[in-house]
Interface confidence: low
């Protein structure tokens, strides 16, 4: 999906009002220095591409993020403020339904959500300072 047509200010507002708090809740009990940020982005569309990938694509050791509150709110924000986004996500929704129903917070998931926090922070202050 091409995120260049999204309403970035509205997505930023959604992040600041709710998504950021849900990410903090998920990470509660984890030290902020525990994980190194290895994923970055160079501008807002690029950040949203990386955020979508980390939030909704199951990875080895972390298959369940899509059912978390921050993920559902992220999906809603993208669906509302990115024209045509919902239509591109039909296959992704089918895959999500097949994911395990139980929420398991693994260390890998915590690391992934830590990366997401960094991407969202970068989304609010775009422009990668070092490529």
């Amino acid at each position: 999906y091409d995120f260049t047509n999204c309403d970035f200010e509205k997505i930023k507002a959604a992040y600041l009002s709710t998504i950021s708090k849900d990410l903090i809740t998920y990470m509660s009990g984890t030290k902020s220095t525990e994980f190194n940020n290895t994923v970055s982005c160079s501008n807002r569309p690029h950040c949203l591409t990386e955020i979508q990938s980390l939030t909704f694509n199951p990875t080895a050791g972390c298959a369940s993020l899509a059912k978390e509150m921050f993920a559902m709110k992220t999906k809603a924000a993208l669906a509302i403020w990115c024209p045509g986004y919902s239509e591109t996500q039909i296959n992704a929704t089918q895959a999500m339904k097949k994911a395990r129903k139980s929420k398991v917070t693994t260390n890998k998931c915590l690391e992934q959500v830590s990366q997401l926090q960094g991407l969202w922070r970068r989304f609010n202050r775009p422009l990668l300072k070092q490529q």
Partner: antibody, heavy 117, light 107 residues
Amino acid sequence: EVQLVQSGAEVKKPGASVKVSCKASGYTFTTYWMHWVKQAPGQGLEWMGMIDPSDSETTLIQKFKDKVTMTVDKSTSTAYMELSSLRSEDTAVYYCARTLDGYYDYWGQGTTVTVSS
Amino acid sequence: DIQMTQSPSSLSASVGDRVTITCRASENIYSYLAWYQQKPGKSPQLLVYFAKTLAEGVPSRFSGSVSGTQFTLTISSLQPEDFATYYCQHHYGTPWTFGGGTKVEIK
């Protein structure tokens, strides 16, 4: 109305320094990065580097690292770009330009720096 | 560093002509490309960003497109005020780089 107003033309001798200013108005100064772009006479545009006005973090391309110092004064919403040890090849028009996503929606009017003995 | 190769370096055209300027990136920059217009003695002006989004106040005769690493700026019907130099610039990450420019002259 967004405006970037740069300081006037400068004529300097080789070896001297010059400080170009770029005063921003009409928007929140710390929200946007400030970039500087060089245009030598009859040449194209060359990106020099950028400064984040919120924390003064700068990124310069290698060729300008020993030549350029970028600073900001948040109290006056002004960005500065200082060129040191001036040589003839520093003769150019220097532009400030603001950006959020890497493209420049507003530019200063340009400051001509002439280095001549 | 990402290199931006712009062509042609200059072209002659008449009012009403369709003009196409291309820019090729040395690697994938997705849609992160801007186009600027510069007239003699003036600052560059943003025309297009994210490869195909028209900047505010830019006439609809200007359009941008992308195919892989090749980007195109098209002026559908050249007007007298369009005679200028045009630059592409990638905005994918540091260091930002510009194309060499295309000077559009009156035939």
